[in-house]
């Protein structure tokens, strides 16, 4: 899977998008989850309703709502008071019994409120010199990971 | 009326190939994944892969990966099994089976089966 | 691979009996469990998904019940048409696993 980055700025909403076919996960659950580490476990965040014909209905876990748009075929994030803490890598699942297959790998990066005067080394998101495999270029209000880009900050 | 209607029973030598196939009628077929069974000489269920016709996704049991390659044609309703290299070992019924998945339980049962191919190898 | 157990592998039973077959999951399937009737020369048949669902057109005779590791499969009184071999098979992780079978006969 190819990685997807979204943009958004610290204290502000982010919504994240994952297109599916709607078919292909006919009757199937949603999830979000956060990966930890590189090789890590994917840690669900937040899922959609357990009764899938009410996936339209938005599930909230803390600052963070998921929605299934299960016809159109297009699950919906909301990472509401984005903070630096929320930067790294998630991926948008799809469940059936108790596996999950990855709807779309997601790369979040925290930008600095540009209004907000205090430090922003706290806020991190990759740099072009850090390495990635299989990401593509995809310009809006998100992105796909550059050639060279890695997901996760270089650790010590 | 839903029906996988498979194709006829094959005896082959060792280490000949085979491909079986299933015609799936009577609903859309790119919407369900298509998986194969087999059975064995008097014996159990065994699960071998899954395939999605409409993206062609697939997966395999760990002890069938490598040994045979599930195929579909979509174009023509028609999901495959096959083999490059048979072993007496495989000789036995193989079935293709429409996975459904149910609404309330976001897991998927075989509801249609295919009425079987039995697949004899011989010297 | 979740291993499936089924016990007893064979019973004896008569018409109008009340028959339990169980299947034991190597590891928590919560309900993701599945029933099958087999005759001779057939392609098995859905009776049972969800641990509890009843197949459309299955008779209500039959009911399943479990969660976790331990299933049942209970026929309320059996018909003649029931004698044949059933499988239990768990949908909760790939590869998708089955039962060894239990096989019904007359008595």
């Known amino acids: 899977h190819n990685t997807t980055v979204f943009q958004g700025v610290a204290g502000q909403s982010l919504q994240v998008s994952c297109p599916y076919d709607s078919m292909k996960h006919w009757g199937r659950r949603k999830a979000w989850c956060r990966q930890l580490g590189e090789k890590g476990p994917c840690q669900r965040v937040v899922s959609t309703h357990n009764l899938w014909l009410l996936s339209f209905l938005r599930r909230w876990n803390g600052s963070t709502a998921i929605t299934d748009d299960t016809l159109g075929g297009t699950l919906t994030i909301t990472l509401r008071n984005l903070q630096p803490h929320d930067a790294g890598l998630y991926q948008c699942q799809s469940l059936h019994g108790s596996e999950a297959d990855t709807l779309r790998k997601v790369l979040v990066e925290v930008l600095a409120d540009p209004l907000d005067h205090r430090d922003a080394g706290d806020l991190w998101f990759p740099g072009e010199s850090e390495s990635f495999e299989d990401a593509h270029v995809e310009h809006s209000i998100s992105r796909s990971l550059l050639e060279g880009e890695i997901p996760f900050p270089p650790t010590s | 009326e839903v029906q996988l209607v498979q194709s006829g029973a094959e005896v082959k030598k060792p280490g000949e190939s085979l491909k079986i196939s299933c015609k799936g009628s009577g609903y859309s077929f790119t919407s369900y994944w298509i998986a194969w069974v087999r059975q064995m000489p008097g014996k159990g269920l065994e699960w071998m892969g899954i395939i999605y016709p409409g993206d062609s996704d697939t997966r395999y049991a760990p002890s069938f990966q490598g040994q045979v390659t599930i195929s579909a044609d979509k174009s023509i309703s028609t999901a495959y099994l096959q083999w490059s290299s048979l072993k007496a070992s495989d000789t036995a019924m193989y079935f293709c089976?429409?996975?459904?998945?149910?609404?309330?339980?976001?897991?998927?049962?075989?509801?249609?089966w295919g009425q079987g191919t039995l697949v004899t190898v011989s010297s | 691979d979740i291993q499936m157990t089924q016990s007893p592998s064979s019973v004896s039973a008569s018409v109008g009996d009340r028959v339990t077959i169980t299947c034991r999951a190597s590891?928590?399937?919560?309900?993701?469990l599945a029933w099958y009737q087999q005759k001779p020369g057939k392609a098995p048949k859905l009776l049972i998904y969800?641990?509890?669902s009843l197949q459309r057109g299955v008779p209500s005779r039959f009911s399943g019940s479990g969660s976790g590791t331990d299933f049942t499969l209970t026929i309320s009184s059996l018909q003649p048409e029931d004698f044949a071999t059933y499988f239990c098979q768990q949908a909760d992780s790939f590869p998708r696993t089955f039962g060894q079978g239990t096989k019904l006969e007359i008595k």
């Open positions: 969800a641990a509890s």
């Open positions: 089976v429409r996975s459904r998945t149910f609404y309330y339980d976001s897991s998927d049962y075989f509801d249609y």
């Open positions: 590891q928590g399937i919560s309900s993701w």
